[in-house]
């Protein structure tokens, strides 16, 4: 179930997955929630003696049991991911942090009259992930009222330092407040030749687009279908970027599908989850558990309720079926995507719905028997 | 469906085949189950054949070639074509069929949710069109139900592609810039469904297109969210009439 409480002066021991810098525990919790494997986190609000670089450290953790031993640590805040917290799920982070310099790669500097204006500049710049604003009281006159637009490979600051009269914050693209626009075009039989930031295995271009949307540096993508000539690239989703923020002209390529991230969309932002169940498909990955259930929908439900499950395969092979149902294999991987996709007539596969805002319901909202 | 793939049994349990039985029996259009006694389809399916008794409706079917004279079908009790539908125009291409007897819901035959009126501005990103129609412009009806995923196209953009037509707010367009995937002849009246917030919704009714799967020529669908009041009103008034005529 949903565990949203925070534990003060507590640090979880072990289970380390990744460490990043975040300005507060709430932001750390958000980062953990949207990380494919993170279930628990510990945040250091106060720097430990002699380890000043650990202040603002956000330590993302996992555990097979869903819990880790707690140790007392002054100034540490720990908690759980909100992966199963339905209505609390949001990547949007609107808080402003006074007296903090969130460092990263400064790619643009301009004069603005307010923090709000600076945040808007960041929200409306395709590359900007976070910003720092120097107020009119900043000690260096030449930087006063300057807005620094920043980015990093992780989408989070490379370090955070307390500095008087600096104010920092994040882009509000994830709050659906960007005015950049929303290019929803899908280009069939076209590939973008731009810089790859990452690649994942996906069953179709729509999942690829959603993965791109929630990747910090993906601006557009190219997906190679199951018919693609190079076997190792079949069902591979290449997440891409470019200096200009726009793709270079696409190349005609049979069995390739390309499109854009929807992270700048206002209305069409997808949820960070994939509802569709793919029949005739098997998702490979690290086996978490196997149960016997009746139908692929029930298998998806089981995966959704199993917090570590990222995706599943439901098998209808005679040897995989018993009186109580057929085999539902719950799986996971390092990046949340299958390690490989194969095509098997007797299989159905899909993803956990743990990051979906609204819980699945078979009830229709418009009732035709009501007036 | 052009550029689609075979569906599996029960994948689209709301899809029905509307067939006409004259000398021979032929699949004419698709339709969607929206209630135990109600099918939603396109008005143009009945142009020239507005006679309820020649139509047969098959639900829970994947392969049309498996239909025999023993296959159960539903008959039309009442055919309600939108009062503003005109054969000379493309607007108001929507019709309701009231069945003689209510359907039994099964894994393979159950209703699709209707959107709410508030969904007129919802942007859907996971949409599918299904049908037994042609797989190319000069093709033939398919035996196995076909499916294809298709992105929605904003109305303003769609209007630019169809300068000789009026794309009204009661229409919704879907297709790929490069073409290649689309509904086609025989898919009319069938569903354009989108999964939104974990729920499949009937977003469009296959209506028309310039050819099939042509470059820069999206498919045009009747936008169901714009007709919710009409659908509810017709179903309700049909119920009220039934009450008036039933024995005391």
């Amino acid at each position: 179930g949903c565990l949203s409480q925070l534990y003060a002066n507590t640090f979880f021991r072990g289970g380390d997955l990744a460490a990043i810098y975040t300005p507060d525990a709430q932001h750390c919790q958000k980062m953990c929630t949207f990380h494919p494997r993170c279930l628990l986190f510990s945040f250091l609000a106060v720097s430990p003696t002699k380890e000043t670089d650990k202040r603002f450290g956000c330590f993302m953790k996992e555990s097979i049991t869903g819990t880790l031993p707690r140790i007392h640590r002054t100034g540490a805040i720990s908690g759980h991911s909100l992966k199963q917290c339905g209505h609390q799920l949001s990547a949007c982070h609107q808080d402003i942090y006074e007296g903090l310099d969130m460092r990263g790669s400064n790619f643009n500097i301009s004069k603005t009259d307010s923090i709000e204006e600076c945040q808007k500049l960041c929200t409306n710049n395709i590359h900007c992930q976070f910003f720092t604003y120097a107020t009119k009281a900043f000690h260096r006159p030449e930087y006063r009222k300057s807005c620094l637009l920043k980015r990093s490979s992780s989408g989070t600051p490379t370090s955070i330092k307390p500095v008087d009269n600096l104010v920092s914050g994040f882009s509000l693209k994830s709050c659906a407040l960007s005015e950049i626009g929303c290019p929803m075009d899908i280009f069939q039989h076209f590939a973008f030749a731009d810089l790859n930031v990452s690649h994942v295995v996906t069953p179709d271009a729509f999942v690829c687009r959603t993965v791109c949307t929630f990747h910090p540096n993906c601006l557009f993508f190219t997906f190679y279908t199951n018919e693609w000539e190079t076997e190792s690239q079949r069902n591979v989703c290449f997440l891409k970027t470019s200096k200009s923020g726009r793709p270079s002209p696409p190349i005609i390529q049979e069995n390739a599908v390309s499109g854009y991230s929807l992270f700048t969309c206002r209305k069409a932002r997808p949820e960070p989850c994939h509802f569709k169940i793919y029949s005739g498909v098997a998702f490979e990955g690290e086996e978490l558990n196997a149960t016997f259930v009746q139908g692929a929908d029930a298998c998806q439900e089981t995966c959704t309720k199993t917090i570590r499950c990222q995706f599943f395969t439901y098998s209808l092979l005679p040897q995989d079926c018993k009186a109580e149902g057929c085999k539902c294999s719950l799986r996971l991987s390092t990046d949340g995507s299958p390690t490989r996709i194969t095509y098997e007539a007797q299989g159905s596969s899909g993803y956990s719905l743990r990051l979906c805002k609204v819980v699945e319901s078979s009830d229709c909202t418009t009732k035709i028997n009501a007036r | 469906i052009v550029g689609g793939t075979n569906s599996s049994l029960g994948e689209w349990p709301w899809q029905v085949s509307l067939q006409v039985k004259l000398v021979s029996q032929n699949h004419m259009c698709g339709g969607s189950i929206i209630g135990r006694q109600w099918i939603l389809t396109a008005a143009h399916c009945f142009d020239g054949i507005p006679y309820p008794d020649v139509w047969r409706i098959y639900g829970g079917i994947l392969n049309l070639s498996e239909i025999t004279n023993k296959t159960p079908f539903s008959s039309i009790k009442e055919l309600i074509i939108h009062q503003k539908y005109k054969m000379s125009e493309g607007s108001y291409d929507i019709a309701l069929i009231k069945l003689q007897t209510p359907l039994n819901y099964t894994e393979f035959q159950k209703p699709i949710c209707l959107p709410s009126k508030a969904d007129t501005n919802t942007i859907y990103t996971n949409c599918w069109v299904t049908g037994w129609g042609y797989t190319k412009e000069r093709g033939e009806t398919q035996n196995i139900l076909q499916k294809a995923t298709i992105p929605l196209v904003p109305n303003e953009e769609c209007q630019k592609k169809y300068r000789d037509y009026v794309i009204t707010k009661q229409m919704i367009c879907a297709g790929y810039k490069e073409g290649g995937i689309d509904a086609c002849k025989g898919d009319s009246g069938g569903p354009l469904v989108c999964k939104h917030s974990g729920r499949w919704q009937l977003v469009g009714i296959t209506s028309w297109g310039e050819g099939c799967a042509r470059k820069e020529q999206p498919g045009v669908y009747t936008k169901v969210a714009e007709y919710i009041d009409w659908i509810l009103e017709k179903i309700q008034s049909s119920k009220e009439r039934a009450l008036e005529t039933s024995p005391a």
Epitope: - | D47, S88, G133, R138, K185, G186
Partner: antibody, heavy 125, light 108 residues
């Protein structure tokens, strides 16, 4: 009741100009594509031009391209044909017609369902 | 352009007889875009058949249309006195839209 009424025809010298009008009533004019068709004395029907419902798209027969301009005023429910550089071979009865565009088998249909009574244009010196 | 060739040029028949008019197109025409019109002297043309086979409103059922691709036919099952006129086929599948040269149905 749908009605189309042409006017503006008459005798004009070669090289001259004429503007035909077609007043429409009984239907939502702005929803329909409109067309002009002509018929030379004792000859068959010849399509001249059409205009999209909004007026933003026009197409012409090669024989009139560059000389004739089709336009419409949806607020006045009126279709126009501006004819310049007229030639003797443009002598004909000019009909305006409504283009019906229904739907059949998931495609559109196209046909001229209502015609005006025609207006005669004579080009002669 | 798509050329429509109608045959015969003239058809001489008596009332009560069956008339079969042919329209051949130089290229494939989607039957949805093939129409037939009737024209009597001094009158505007009148729509008879659209979509190759659908009768227009108010047209008697003795008129029927058939055909697809490049061969289309208009049939008048039993000629009535008012049916003697010129008949045109027309395509709007591709621009320029074109008419056939017409078939005159006259009283024998």
């Amino acid at each position: 009741e749908v009605q189309l009424l042409e006017s503006g025809g008459g005798l004009v010298q070669p090289g001259g100009s004429l503007r035909l009008s077609c007043a429409a009533s009984g239907f939502t004019f702005s929803h329909y594509l409109m067309t002009w068709v002509r018929q030379a004395p004792g000859k068959g029907l010849e399509w001249v031009s059409y205009i999209s419902p909004s007026g933003g798209h026009t197409i012409y027969a090669d024989s009139v391209k560059g000389r004739f301009t089709i336009s419409r005023d949806n607020s006045k429910n009126t279709l126009y044909l501006q004819m310049n550089s007229l030639r003797a071979e443009d002598t004909a009865v000019y009909y305006c017609a409504r283009v019906a565009r229904g739907i059949a088998a998931r495609s559109r249909t196209s046909y001229f369902d209502y015609w005006g009574q025609g207006t005669l244009v004579t080009v002669s010196s | 352009e798509i050329v429509l060739t109608q045959s015969p040029g003239t058809l001489s028949l008596s009332p009560g007889e069956r008339a079969t008019l042919s329209c051949r197109t130089s290229q494939f025409v989607n039957s949805n875009y093939l129409a037939w019109y009737q024209q009597k002297p001094g009158q505007a043309p009148r729509l008879l058949i659209y979509g190759a086979s659908s009768r227009a409103t108010g047209i008697p059922d003795r008129f029927s249309g058939s055909g697809s691709g490049t061969d289309f036919t208009l049939t008048i099952s039993r000629l009535e006195p008012e049916d003697f006129a010129v008949y045109y086929c027309q395509q709007s599948s591709r621009t320029p839209w074109t008419f056939g040269q017409g078939t005159k149905v006259e009283i024998k």
